[in-house]
Amino acid sequence: MEPRAVADALETGEEDAVTEALRSFNREHSQSFTFDDAQQEDRKRLAKLLVSVLEQGLSPKHRVTWLQTIRILSRDRSCLDSFASRQSLHALACYADIAISEEPIPQPPDMDVLLESLKCLCNLVLSSPTAQMLAAEARLVVRLAERVGLYRKRSYPHEVQFFDLRLLFLLTALRTDVRQQLFQELHGVRLLTDALELTLGVAPKENPLVILPAQETERAMEILKVLFNITYDSVKREVDEEDAALYRYLGTLLRHCVMADAAGDRTEEFHGHTVNLLGNLPLKCLDVLLALELHEGSLEFMGVNMDVINALLAFLEKRLHQTHRLKECVAPVLSVLTECARMHRPARKFLKAQVLPPLRDVRTRPEVGDLLRNKLVRLMTHLDTDVKRVAAEFLFVLCSESVPRFIKYTGYGNAAGLLAARGLMAGGRPEGQYSEDEDTDTEEYREAKASINPVTGRVEEKPPNPMEGMTEEQKEHEAMKLVNMFDKLSR
Amino acid sequence: MGCTLSAEDKAAVERSKMIDRNLREDGEKAAREVKLLLLGAGESGKSTIVKQMKIIHEAGYSEEECKQYKAVVYSNTIQSIIAIIRAMGRLKIDFGDAARADDARQLFVLAGAAEEGFMTAELAGVIKRLWKDSGVQACFNRSREYQLNDSAAYYLNDLDRIAQPNYIPTQQDVLRTRVKTTGIVETHFTFKDLHFKMFDVGGQRSERKKWIHCFEGVTAIIFCVALSDYDLVLAEDEEMNRMHESMKLFDSICNNKWFTDTSIILFLNKKDLFEEKIKKSPLTICYPEYAGSNTYEEAAAYIQCQFEDLNKRKDTKEIYTHFTCATDTKNVQFVFDAVTDVIIKNNLKDCGLF
């Protein structure tokens, strides 16, 4: 049914005809996400009519149908202005049961109505800056947070929980004031950590899950994204003991997430959100990643369970295959691994053994090849300085921040970017916090050491002198040509 | 009959081993000597790399050393405002407030009479009023059309602090200073068993013998280029844009017979300035044939290719390209949340409509 016909039916006002028109429109457009310009004015007119009814109150019998039509039109950018008003948003919030209320509604809300309203709000907040502002002013986050806190007590359908969390994600992603409010006033980290535990269905002492079901995966990912939004600009501050305990507890849940698989093919996505959030934990709380007790089948190194570190390394390997969105794919996991390595000697030694094993192949440049080391060295000259920096920093820490060792494994040419940035091109401070770390040379390396070009990091035969056979005068003449060039350059 | 060695034989074997070891160590010592040539145009960020070494490495500049830069800071500040005022005439830009013309005249008088390392309150007041003028700001915004230090705005915006009688330059102030480097500055440093000699080559033609020893057996050339130079208009005495000038020299050096097997470390500096500029000044100013978008990623990659493609010995000669932002020491301390904004944006992008 065309929007004009629906709008005409609405204006005549006969209830059954209106409902039938809306139903027909909904059926036809349930999967429409782009709209024809030719009917834009008709859709805008229909949107205005829907809004006027919405603001006066929808009849209980047909609320879901009306809200479905609103949801479809809220996908159309040209209709956003009609829906993004204070009254419309308030009406939708009331139907979603997230308006600040003087009295709790005595009867349980209709879940279908609640769900449709939440979907409308998600569409509006995603697409309309005005709706974002109005939603923040209406403090929708308060009742959303309250409802998240109720998941333990009352059973809400998966979809309601998912859209609650999605709306929370959108509000915190798009509004810094809401982010702050959820983080501070509304105890967001505790609230969502609690929700995450409930969703994962684990207590931190238990063994990791095998596979997280599809719905739980969806909800967990939304929770992880909201937690990311509210912690990324907050946890850079020092945390007190009470907060540190909370973040450590969150860390134990994230440890579970890293070790768990997700249903379908969503494991990497799930791990991605987990790793992003790990990067926001206060550094002193990352020790929980190495706190898993040893059990049969776990990977032990220097008496420490390395399962989580190993899982993160495997995740990094997977992510390095991608070319698209490289920065956000690899920087978080590299950051987490770097900090673990920086603070924990066993983690550093384990990672070094995996990533920078003692050098054997000294005939190939460090950036050539398919080993993890080669891929990371390649990133050290990446166009994106953030990518370059995290890759270089990771390898530098694995070298115990020893410049000679760093050059040995990566070559001075590749290392120059980090060294220049840190003011270490001409050496550096004496080795500090890592002095106890030894580096072992293989027989192959020792044999070839004298022939290794420190700049390229590989064995190179001494090149013939290009000036061989020239007289001093000729050499001087050539040199002066260069000098003239440099003179030009430095003017 | 046993195969035991006599005492003399044993001693002879030991002596022979020792000689071999010493020969090998001598060979290693020679092989482990790394000779670096540091090259770059006037404001390529070359000297900043050297200064940066000093700042983060060791404990930075001492207060005494910082004090010695006071005169340079003042000179840079005064030269910058003078360059802008002169350019106003050339670009036919009027002062926003006509009264500033008197200040401009006064500036030349006071600047000429200024004692090195001192800035009078009167001179500071004149500079401050001029810098605030809308005409001066308009001219500053067109600085790509004349020669102006990158640090101009940094010092002029901070004039209140700099003009204090008890002013001592900060590490960041020192990093921003601009002094013409001449001749060769040789730096030696050692990484464990690697002995580095870095020759910072200025443009002065000092004695020839010195140059020859400089060019022989170079392991790597560090070549600095300011990415942000791409849109600078030619000065009257220039034949080509500074970026093209750098490329021409890079070509000559990269393919010069002295440096047949010499690796090149190419520093494309001032990426922060470039990132800002590229939003407003298209890359076609420098490369008319460029057909890509004016995003940092695409434009920077194009410049990188322009330089790397000049290498005629791709199979034997390595070019290591690094994009850097030399003046920001904070930028180089490890940033844990380098990507948070991008993550949120992408998480939003992945959110569909319902």
């Epitope: 600040i100 209320s101 003087e102 009295e103 709790p104 403090r139 308060v142 009742r143 947070a145 309250e146 998240v148 806190g149 109720l150 333990r152 006033e185 509304l186 105890h187 505790r190 609230l191 609690d194 009470e242 | -």
Partner: nanobody, 126 residues
């Protein structure tokens, strides 16, 4: 020992206003629902008003609707009761109470509340 301390009670004329405050001794209370109850001599304890942990949901007893307002300031771990248009029948001892469950949204029933203050007397003379 967790404490709830009420203040602000006193003797007022009918039609006057009064503001009660209740401050908790621990930060965790900012995650609990809190309420005000009252008990007049010889009567049952009744709910005056309650507020969820985040302040998004409020409950009022029928007799005070439109006259009393409950609010909270989680940064100060304090809950307030603003009483306007007071009547002699509002005379009672007013108790502050808290539910000891994290992220609780509150309730009309006294049995749901785990912590109680000592009470503050409010007397409204005609």
């Amino acid at each position: 020992q967790v404490q709830l301390v009420e203040s602000g009670g006193g003797l007022v004329q009918a039609g006057d206003s009064l503001r009660l405050s209740c401050t908790a001794s621990e930060r965790a209370f900012s995650r609990y629902a809190m309420g005000w109850f009252r008990q007049a001599p010889g009567k049952e304890r009744e709910l005056v008003a309650a507020v969820s942990w985040a302040g998004g949901t409020t409950y009022y007893g029928d007799s005070v609707k439109g006259r009393f307002t409950i609010s909270r300031d989680n940064a100060k771990i304090t809950v307030y009761l603003q009483m306007n248009s007071l009547k002699p029948e509002d005379t009672a001892v007013y108790y502050c109470a808290a539910e000891a469950r994290e992220f609780s949204v509150g309730s009309y029933y006294a049995t749901e509340y785990d912590y109680w203050g000592q009470g503050t007397q409010v007397t409204v003379s005609s």
